[in-house]
């Protein structure tokens, strides 16, 4: 950066090189050039010469004043016009930054995705700070009082093997940058209560041509958790509101859920599960599309796969890809 240049003088910022966005700031430049009594001192911001708000303080020093400085980053340098020098002489440069102190981190959430081997902790960091902000995640055993700290810039994955202080912990997040420090409330967790079952996936759908046509959705999960509660939501793609069906599920076999749907309409399905009675849900599964037949059953497949028509009695949709859910962050 500009801070690495060889200086023939000194540049400094008041109140500081990192300051709160919107502040009035002063940038001072003091020349110390051999055999040069500067005729004029110039300031440059991001390579562009500043024309206004420059005050000469004495023979070697000048001040540039900014009102309500709003740029997150700027490179400043100053030069001198020396007698008998054709070009301006560089005095010094400095990178300056403006931003905000961190907000109090809130909505601290820790979950263990089944089979991941990690506890994943996330939080709401609040408003953008614009400057380098670090987070320390504190994990303290309620049984041994031992505390571990993890330094991060965003979320954190903590190996469950490193959580050797029993099952009960407090977790809190400390946010710090050059302008301040804040700390979240403490979240009390029990490792057995924060496990999210292995993802539930809709594999296929079929519509059976009976007196009343019936659509069967086939879905499964690799979870080893015995008591699992799930929700399946579905709607016509033209609709805004979802219908939700609830299930108590045992994943020792593939689940089959029946729906009585309107004919000749494209539907979208999603499923999510949680350990029964626990706090956190899986994110909704990928969008699964199925079009019901007009009168003859139809075969369709997942997102972006063309609708295939079948003259037989059964119509199926098969999951082939993964389309990210629009609600993938919904674990609460």
């Amino acid at each position: 950066g500009i801070t690495n240049i060889n200086c023939s003088g000194h540049i400094w910022v008041e109140p500081a090189t990192i300051f709160k966005m919107g502040m009035n700031i002063s940038i001072y430049c003091q020349a110390a050039i051999k055999n040069c009594q500067p005729r004029k001192l110039h300031f440059y911001k991001n390579g562009i010469k500043e024309r206004f708000q420059i005050t000469r303080i004495n023979k070697t020093t000048a001040r540039l004043w900014y009102k309500n400085f709003l740029e997150p980053h700027a490179s400043m340098y100053c030069t001198a016009e020396c007698p008998k020098h054709f070009q301006e002489t560089l005095i010094c440069g400095k990178d300056i930054s403006s931003g905000y102190p961190p907000d109090i981190p809130d909505e601290v959430t820790c979950v263990i995705y089944e089979y991941s081997g990690n506890m994943t902790c996330t939080w709401n960091a609040g408003k953008l700070t614009y400057i380098d902000t670090k987070y320390v995640v504190h994990v303290k055993s309620l049984e041994t009082e031992e505390e571990q700290q993890y330094l991060t810039s965003s979320y954190i994955n903590i190996s469950t093997d490193s959580l050797q202080g029993g099952k009960k912990y407090l977790v809190w997040v400390q946010a710090a940058n050059a302008l301040g420090m804040e700390e979240s409330k403490q979240l009390q967790i029990h490792l057995d209560d924060i496990v999210i079952p292995s993802a539930a996936v809709i594999s296929r759908a079929e519509t059976i041509n009976a007196t009343v046509p019936k659509t069967i959705i086939y879905w499964d999960s690799q979870t080893t958790i015995e008591k699992v509660s799930c929700e399946m939501r579905y709607k016509a793609t033209t609709n805004q509101t979802w219908n939700v069906k609830e299930f108590d599920t045992n994943f020792t076999y593939v689940q089959q859920s029946e729906f009585y749907l309107e004919p000749n309409i494209k539907y979208v399905f999603q499923v999510r599960c949680q350990e029964t009675g626990k706090r956190y849900w899986q994110p909704w599964s990928s969008l699964f599309f199925h079009k019901t037949p007009e009168t003859v059953p139809q075969v369709t497949s997942k997102a972006f796969q063309h609708d295939t028509w079948n003259s037989g009695l059964t119509v199926a949709s098969i999951s082939t890809g993964h389309l990210t859910s629009d609600n993938r962050g919904d674990i609460g």
């Epitope: 320390v136 009082e145 031992e146 505390e147 571990q148 700290q149 809190w172 400390q174 403490q186």
Partner: antibody, heavy 121, light 112 residues
């Protein structure tokens, strides 16, 4: 057995900086641990000054009344920690203790012998 | 800012008495509380940690109880060597930017 050995001057002039060192032996320096400083003015109670957490990173915590005046630094190559308190006044006259449990808990099984620091001209 | 309030500030008791000292935290500190004994000219000595766990080498006449905000140190039968000053200390977290002190004001146990 964890041992803490304190060193530093017993007399400091007003407005100067109080500097003390605490050398630690007998702990696993590869584990996480807290090292803290506490003081006790004559005839008064225990007053927490601050702590340093040493683990995968280093973090310091200071009593809010001391912020801006206090610095706790590790010198892990020598297995010791320093306390610096700037701009001292006679009110800073106290016995200063370093303390730890040798782990990342905040209660103190082990204490230094204490150093009486007098602030006087 | 978590504040620790200890009471009484002093008490007089006789050998064999049952003595109770209380400590109140201004917010929930779970079971993260320690008790210390200090004699004149000596460093404090850890008696109890995690509110109720006895430190190594501490006689069983000392016991601690409580969680959340209210805690008690009990000496079931006061002995001559127990005349000293006792302090509680919150051991929950020191990362809070507003902490002033983590110790209670102390309770001096004197001979009646």
């Amino acid at each position: 057995q964890v041992q803490l050995q304190q060193s530093g001057p017993g007399l400091v002039k007003p407005s100067q900086t109080l500097s003390l060192t605490c050398a630690i032996s007998g702990i696993d320096f590869n584990s996480n641990y807290y090292m803290c400083w506490i003081r006790q003015s004559p005839g008064r109670g225990l007053e927490w000054l601050g702590c340093i957490y040493v683990g995968s990173h280093v973090n310091t915590y200071y009593a809010n009344w001391a912020k801006g005046r206090i610095t706790i630094n590790p010198d892990t190559s020598k297995n010791q920690f320093s306390l610096q308190l700037n701009s001292v006044t006679p009110e800073d006259t106290a016995v200063y203790y370093c303390a730890t449990s040798g782990s990342s808990v905040l209660y103190f099984k082990f204490w230094g012998q204490g150093t009486l620091v007098t602030v006087s001209s | 800012d978590i504040q620790m309030t200890q009471s009484p500030s002093s008490l007089s008791a006789s050998v064999g008495d049952r003595v109770t000292i209380t400590c109140q935290a201004s917010e929930n500190i779970y079971s993260f509380l320690a008790w210390y004994q200090q004699k004149p000219g000596k460093a404090p000595k850890l008696l109890i940690y995690s509110a109720s766990k006895l430190a190594a080498g501490v006689p069983s006449r000392f016991s601690g109880s409580g969680s959340g905000t209210d805690f008690t140190l009990t000496i079931s039968s006061l002995q001559p060597e127990d005349f000293a000053t006792y302090y509680c200390q919150q051991t929950n977290r020191y990362s809070n930017p507003d902490i002033y002190n983590v110790f209670g004001q102390g309770t001096k146990v004197e001979i009646k």
